[in-house]
């Protein structure tokens, strides 16, 4: 897993940026873990970044992700945490110029290097669930969420609202 200095260096620059015509409401660095307290980690392997879900050793530092929050510009009937039909969306960046992307064809979650404006595949609708957990729904594919499968992140189709509480699509965010 790599450090967060790169993220910290460009956090301020992002505040002034405009992504798909809108600026983030707020941004902050947080570690991402599963409902069962496994950490989401990122590693550079063969010139590309891999995403892992793993138990960290006691004193091992958690990787941080820069979360940028946006308000959807157009009203929506989706079930995100919105009032008056608008939703909160988020992008997740673990290191400079790389963002989590939904690859709907492969049902995978990947880290892609890209320039702004970010593609829709980098945006996820934020849902706030019980125990202050969150889930991330693909903007490009409603009903499909980031989830955990075989110690990796994957895209998981959620068929009904009852399955929104399925543990494998619930994540915890922590600033500590």
């Amino acid at each position: 897993a790599f450090g967060i200095s790169g993220v910290q260096k460009y956090t301020r620059a992002l505040h002034d940026s405009s992504i798909t015509g809108i600026s983030p409401i707020t941004e902050y660095l947080a570690s991402l873990s599963t409902y069962n307290d496994q950490s989401i980690t990122f590693a550079l392997e063969d010139e590309s970044y891999e995403i892992y879900v793993e138990d960290l050793k006691k004193d091992e530092k958690k990787d941080k992700v820069l979360l940028s929050y946006y308000e959807s510009q157009h009203p929506s009937n989706e079930s995100g945490d919105g009032v008056d039909g608008k939703m909160l969306m988020v992008t997740l960046s673990p290191t400079k110029d790389f963002w989590l992307h939904a690859n709907n064809k492969e049902h995978s979650v990947e880290l892609h290097k890209c320039e702004k404006p970010l593609p829709d595949q980098a945006f996820f609708v934020l849902h706030n669930m019980h125990s202050n957990c969150v889930s991330f729904e693909c903007k490009t594919d409603p009903g499909v969420f980031i989830g955990v499968k075989d110690n990796h992140l994957a895209l998981i189709k959620v068929d009904s609202s009852e399955n929104l509480c399925t543990e494998n699509i619930l994540f915890k965010l922590s600033e500590t």
Partner: nanobody, 124 residues
Framework: QVQLVESGGGSVQPGGSLRLACAAS????????AGWFRQTPGKEREFVAS????????NYADAVKGRFTISRDNSKNMMYLQMNSLNFEDTAVYYC?????????????????WGQGTQVTVSS
């Protein structure tokens, strides 16, 4: 901007308990740090407790440590303050507030949305 409404205030005897609730409307509550403050007549608003966006970081004023507990439920857009072992010095109007700034926050000036307040009176 978040709209905040406090409830749960009232009169209680020394040693008693109250649970304050803060109902938030506005989608950005869930990405806001939040806190409780209190004010007595003629004095400045003072920090009581604060909580991070997802509840994992909490801070308390020395005067309430061990007696008060702050919590939140983002799925309901709610924040709470459980107040135990109340004493006369806890009598005040209690306000909830939120900020998009980074936690921890204890200065009232850092908070941009405020409720109208709820009165807590400790008397025998």
């Amino acid at each position: 901007q978040v709209q905040l409404v406090e409830s749960g205030g009232g009169s209680v005897q020394p040693g008693g308990s109250l649970r304050l609730a803060c109902a938030a409307s506005g989608r950005i509550f869930v990405i806001s740090n939040a806190g409780w403050f209190r004010q007595t007549p003629g004095k400045e608003r003072e920090f009581v407790a604060s909580i991070s966006r997802h509840g994992e970081i909490t801070n308390y004023a020395d005067a309430v440590k061990g007696r008060f507990t702050i919590s939140r439920d983002n799925s309901k857009n709610m924040m709470y303050l459980q107040m135990n072992s109340l004493n006369f010095e806890d009598t005040a109007v209690y306000y909830c507030a939120t900020t998009l700034g980074h936690s921890p926050r204890t200065d009232p000036g850092d908070f941009d949305s405020w409720g109208q307040g709820t009165q807590v009176t400790v008397s025998s």
